[in-house]
């Protein structure tokens, strides 16, 4: 018979032959042959593989480093990685939660809508027209543009969401 060019789901092609993939939680020891099945071995204590695979090495479980404020939220298994979270009152810097911050800052152009608490991180909002923020801050709101008119001045340079307006003297009409 013709050697296969494609294999079924949960199989892989090797030496013109379809072999079974190893199930999650197990790694490949040896490919199948005409006479033997694929040989797989369970991952070790601190290892995992989360897909049907032909990997010869399992992945190490993630380490939740207490020096970075991390703790284990969910212990890893042979089929799943460890999930880290931050100590109470701290917040993950990313979805992967690789490190912790007390709270995040709002970038220039954004103001703080709500200051962080033990359970929720800083909530930022874009500065609307007429307001600006030129700093990165975890507490400062957007500031209103300076009103040149109330100072008997005129706008020399328009404001943006990151910069205040620049006021200047009014041009005096020559007689």
């Amino acid at each position: 018979p013709e050697p296969p060019t494609a294999c079924r789901e949960k199989q892989y092609l090797i030496n013109s032959q379809c072999c079974s993939l190893c199930q999650p939680g197990q790694k490949l020891v040896s490919d199948c042959t005409e006479f033997t099945e694929t040989e797989c071995l369970p991952c070790g204590e601190s290892e995992f593989l989360d897909t049907w695979n032909r990997e010869t090495h399992c992945h190490q479980h993630k380490y939740c480093d207490p020096n970075l404020g991390l703790r284990v939220q969910q212990k890893g298994t042979s089929e799943t990685d460890t999930i880290c979270t931050c100590e109470e009152g701290w917040h993950c810097t990313s979805e992967a939660c690789e490190s912790c911050v007390l709270h995040r800052s709002c970038s220039p152009g954004f103001g703080v809508k709500q200051i962080a608490t033990g359970v929720s991180d800083t909530i930022c909002e874009p500065c609307p027209v007429g307001f600006f923020s030129n700093v990165s801050s975890a507490f400062e709101k957007c500031h209103p543009w300076t009103s040149c008119e109330t100072k008997d001045l005129v706008v020399q340079q328009a404001g943006t969401n990151k910069t205040d307006v620049v006021c200047g003297p009014q041009d005096r009409l020559r007689a």
């Epitope: 020096n67 970075l68 701290w90 810097t93 911050v101 007390l102 709270h103 700093v135 801050s137």
Partner: nanobody, 116 residues
Framework: EVQLLESGGGLVQPGGSLRLSCAAS???????EMWWVRQAPGKGLERVS?????????YYADSVKGRFTISRDDSKNTLYLQMNSLRPEDTAVYYC?????????WGQGTLVTVSS
């Protein structure tokens, strides 16, 4: 690597005052937003006060407004918290934290105990 060292804590009677200091070394201090946070025994972290990098803007938690004053001296790389009219509920370990607020920028804290 930045190091923050808090000092000035101690035992004080209700109604008394304390001035906490936070000395920063190993990193630029000027221009960075700074916070004082506290942790009472068996409680979570509470954000107490903050000061902008320029020193022009400040924030105070409602629980300390009118009693605490935050300030900074960039020439000395030091942050301060003047605490007046202290109450038993102000008892906590006080920490200063520097932008970007990562866990490894965390000092050892200074213990404030308000008790008669």
């Amino acid at each position: 690597e930045v190091q923050l060292l808090e000092s000035g804590g101690g035992l004080v009677q209700p109604g008394g005052s304390l001035r906490l200091s936070c000395a920063a070394s190993g990193s630029t201090f000027a221009g960075y937003e700074m916070w004082w946070v506290r942790q009472a025994p068996g409680k979570g972290l509470e954000r107490v006060s903050a000061i902008s990098g320029s020193g022009g803007s400040t924030y105070y938690a409602d629980s300390v407004k009118g009693r605490f004053t935050i300030s900074r001296d960039d020439s000395k790389n030091t942050l301060y918290l003047q605490m007046n009219s202290l109450r038993p509920e102000d008892t906590a370990v006080y920490y200063c934290v520097k932008d970007p607020y990562s866990f490894d920028y965390w000092g050892q804290g200074t213990l404030v105990t308000v008790s008669s």
